[in-house]
């Protein structure tokens, strides 16, 4: 019977007695940047071609065996992960081993570079179709190697890589805390976050997503028949460079940006139990597990966007925290979220030709983060229209103005360290929904964007009695771009986009004052490109 | 043994082909920073990935490395190359003392410089 | 180009041992084992065991166990078959094929067994 | 061990015929099925491997089809040099095991 994790990413339209989806990866070359491996083990040969590529410290300890199959043992077993012709997820990649890992796991940042190296000149030399690196490996947060995988992304390269197995915030490892690196965690059978003895799989807003990596079935170094059973992040990362294989084999012209935003889109949502998370981390990690697309075609046609956090500014007064979008996404909208409540809102700036999202801290807080709204909007042209404080007591409002623009995002930054509460709220008038309202104290800032076929609308949710949590979500069809609190009293911790739900925190009900203070509105912007289809058409 | 000779010739050769006014000054207001593992059993100290400005030519990245094998032989300090990197990032990977990196952070075309670091399969 | 080229035909006595060769050529060794598949004359094809090049591990027919033996000399790139205690029904032509997947073979070694 | 069993055992056929062979295997072998070629006094060719698919420099007049335990080679118009025996492998299990054969002869 099919394995569970081969099982768990496959859609239901493909599930037969055997896993067997249309066209395994094979026009897909993928790079595994491992141990050696048994490359003429049943599940992998032919599959796999060993390079002579090897950069790996001497093993530790004076008394230790170099046994052959327990240094095959992880790039064996992750090899037929990926391409295996039984328990492998793309059975039709084809795959090419360098070994940065020694027969006891180790490896060096120095090692990993050289290899990575070697890939980019290899790829200069014979360019080939679409390229996957996997880097199932991890090592404290390194400056070097995270430029390195930067810098071979730019190059076409899609990089997936292994949160880690620390228990701990996968920022703070590398190449997991690249921006550009795909970062998969690991979940089991149950959907649940994988515990590996004491530790168990890393969290945290540098993770993209989750992947089955507990008891995954594999090759087993031990003979050239045998299967094992491993655990850990590699496990899980193996999966999702086997299914961006599978993407890419079916979309070969997938840029990184596109390749990210559709493994999010077909993720299965909300499954996994977020309990296990550290407290402060649970808004951070992505609730994601990796699956395959139901179906390539028709994908293009949708407007695809995702959410990215920005790391903690600190608790100074001034402390600011900056989301970007990856280089060919764009930032539809920006909000901001601190636990404390303290926080003086956020903006759109542009930043190297960019725009970025910015938040800032208040006198008093505990940090703020910043999060971006990254959207695939082929052909757009975005600006950011801004309105300072009003004096009138009707509250700031800025529109967009241009013919053509539709409104995407809004936000609001303030100077005052509190904006008054008492205040009663102002409400957006009806039948203009291309506008943001806000506090008469705050700057208002609208993200504002021509695309074809670009069509936005805006949906409200307000509760007018407290309450922690208030959601609003775009309906079928429709993406959220936008997502913010009407108007930004201060006891709203923030607002932040959950896959196609805009969420608004407000401090615990028990510490609000009256409930005409309580009332807190959601604000959704959702969109949809009409057009994709016709204009990718018509570019063609 | 053999090994450290050969090291000793290279430097030697790498003197006399170098003139002795030799540190240029990093260009005026950047200054290159160090960069080291937070997880110390991690550390790998001895070897430095040595980072230069993007638009380094794979010559300046060799010339910038021979540079600092001759400052340091000039200090007594034996070094070694081991890797010259281009096609990603230009740098170099040297083995070399820990006191040298205050020198090696002053060379024309310097970025940032790292000290190596272990990885583990996951 | 990717072959398998064997050593030529044999006339063992009952009782006798015969070793047959297989030198590869073309392709990259490490990634592929050797098959090893006998076909005795007018008779189907019976595979008889794998080696691998790469660390010179075995997996055996039930129906060899005990008499024959294979073996790799990856600086020749030469896998070898031996066969043991041989028996008139072990007249065969005896072929040696790349990996599991069986894509390419060798020419055939005819090994006769009579007194 | 997994029993496969072809048929015909040979058939008669000629020039710009189509042909077809089945293989049955005595228990499901998903589209583990590879087809082989032999021509007197010589090695056998693979011609389809994984029930379907034809390797580089094989004429697209042969073809596989089937999954679990029924399978068909077919030869959509015979030419000369297709005279020859055909083997089915089941390649699900170890060992890998062989149908008997089919002989196709000049009719």
């Known amino acids: 019977s099919i394995p569970w994790n081969l099982e768990r990413i496959t859609p239901p339209r493909y599930r037969a007695d055997e896993y067997q989806p249309p066209d395994g990866g094979s026009l897909v070359e993928v790079y595994l940047l491992d141990t050696s491996i048994q490359s003429d083990h049943r599940e992998i040969e032919g599959r796999v071609m060993v390079t002579d590529f090897e950069n790996v410290p001497e093993e530790d300890g004076t008394r230790f065996h170099r046994q052959a199959s327990k240094c095959d043992s992880h790039g064996t077993h992750l090899a037929g992960v990926v391409s295996g012709r039984d328990a492998g997820v793309a059975k039709g990649a084809s795959m090419r081993s360098l070994r940065v890992l020694n027969c006891q796991g180790k490896g060096t940042v120095s090692g990993t570079l050289i290899g990575l190296e070697f890939i980019r000149k290899s790829q200069l030399v014979q360019p080939v179709g679409p390229l996957v690196v996997l880097l199932p490996l991890a090592g404290g947060y390194s400056r070097v190697l995270n430029a390195a995988c930067q810098r071979l992304a730019r190059a076409g390269v899609v990089l997936v890589t292994a949160a880690g197995n620390f228990r701990d915030d996968a920022c703070l490892y590398s190449p997991a805390s690249a921006p550009e690196v795909i970062t998969v965690g690991a979940t089991n059978a149950q959907d649940q976050p994988v515990t590996l003895g004491t530790l168990g799989t890393n969290f945290g807003r540098c993770v993209d997503l989750f992947a089955p990596g507990e008891d995954i079935i594999g090759a087993s170094s031990d003979c050239s028949t045998c299967f094992v059973s491993q655990s850990g992040t590699s496990q899980a990362a193996a999966h999702v460079a086997g299914i961006a294989a599978m993407m890419l084999s079916a979309e070969p012209e997938l840029t990184l940006a596109e390749l990210r935003q559709r493994l999010i889109h077909f993720s299965a949502k909300d499954v996994i139990n977020e309990a296990w998370f550290p407290e402060d981390q649970r808004v951070l990690t992505p609730n994601l597990v990796a699956a395959l697309p139901p179906s390539t075609h028709g994908a293009g046609w949708q407007l695809f966007c995702r959410t990215v956090w920005s790391a903690h500014s600190g608790p100074t007064r001034m402390a600011t925290a900056v989301a970007r979008c990856a280089p060919d996404e764009e930032l539809l909208s920006c909000s901001s979220f601190s636990r404390s409540g303290k926080r003086r809102g956020e903006r759109m700036e542009a930043q190297g030709g960019k725009l970025v999202c910015r938040a800032h801290n208040a006198f008093g807080g505990e940090g703020v983060y910043a999060i971006a709204r990254c959207c695939l909007l082929p052909q757009a042209n975005c600006s950011v229209h801004t309105a300072p404080p009003a004096e009138a007591s009707m509250g700031t409002r800025v529109h967009c103005h241009q013919q053509g623009h539709v409104l995407t995002g809004c936000s609001s930054h303030w100077e005052v360290e509190d904006l008054g509460t008492h205040k009663p709220p102002v409400l957006r008038p009806r039948g203009q929904p291309n506008q943001c309202v806000g506090h008469r104290e705050a700057s208002i800032h609208a993200s504002c964007c021509h695309a074809p076929g670009l069509e936005c609308k805006v949906k409200e949710h307000g509760i007018p009695a407290p309450q922690e949590q208030v959601t609003v979500a775009c309906e079928e069809g429709w993406t959220l771009t936008g997502c913010s609190a009407l108007p930004g009293t201060s006891h709203v911790l923030g607002a932040y986009a959950v896959d196609n739900t805009c969420v608004v925190r407000s401090r615990d009900v028990s510490t609000t004052g009256s409930t005409s203070e309580g009332a807190v509105t959601a604000v959704a912007i959702c969109c949809r490109s009409r057009h994709l289809a016709q204009a990718s058409q018509e570019l063609q | 043994q053999e090994d450290e000779d050969g090291d000793y010739e290279e430097l030697v050769l790498a003197l006399r082909s170098e003139e002795d006014g030799l540190a240029e000054a990093p260009e005026h207001g950047t200054t290159a920073t160090f960069h080291r593992c937070a997880k110390d059993p991690w550390r790998l100290p001895g070897t430095y990935v040595v980072v230069l400005k993007e638009e380094t030519h794979l010559s300046q990245s060799e010339r910038t490395a021979r540079r600092l094998q001759a400052q340091a032989a000039r200090r007594g300090y034996l070094t070694k190359i081991l890797h010259v990197f281009h096609g990603l990032l230009p740098g170099f990977l040297v083995k070399m003392s820990g006191d040298l990196l205050e020198l090696a952070l002053k060379l024309p075309h310097v970025d940032y410089i790292e000290e190596d670091s272990s990885v583990f399969a996951q | 180009q990717v072959q398998l080229v064997q050593s030529g035909a044999e006339v063992k006595k009952p009782g006798a041992s015969v070793k047959v060769s297989c030198k590869a050529s073309g392709y990259a060794l490490y990634n592929y084992g050797i098959s090893w598949v006998r076909q005795a004359p007018g008779q189907g094809l019976e595979w008889m065991g794998w080696?691998?090049?790469?660390?010179?591990?075995?997996n055996y027919a039930q129906k060899l166990q005990g008499r024959g033996t294979m073996t790799t000399d990856p600086s020749t790139s030469t896998a070898y078959m031996e066969l043991r205690s041989l028996r008139s029904d072990d007249t065969a032509v005896y072929y040696c094929?790349?990996?599991?997947?069986?894509?390419?073979w060798g020419q055939g070694t005819t090994v006769t067994v009579s007194s | 061990d997994i029993q496969m069993t072809q048929s015909p055992s040979s058939l008669s056929a000629s020039v710009g015929d189509r042909v077809t062979i089945t293989c049955r295997a005595s228990?499901?072998?998903?589209?583990?099925l590879d087809w082989y070629q032999q021509k007197p006094g010589k090695a056998p060719k693979l011609l389809i491997y994984a029930a379907s698919t034809r390797p580089s420099g094989v004429p697209s007049r042969f073809s596989g089809s089937g999954s679990g335990t029924d399978f068909t080679l077919t030869i959509s118009s015979l030419q000369p040099e297709d005279f020859a025996t055909y083997y089915c492998?089941?390649?699900?299990?170890?060992?890998?095991?062989f149908g008997q054969g089919t002989k196709v002869e000049i009719k």
């Open positions: 080696v691998s090049f790469y660390n010179g591990n075995t």
């Open positions: 228990q499901s072998i998903n589209n583990w």
């Open positions: 094929a790349r990996g599991y997947v069986m894509d390419i």
């Open positions: 492998q089941q390649d699900q299990d170890i060992p890998p095991t």
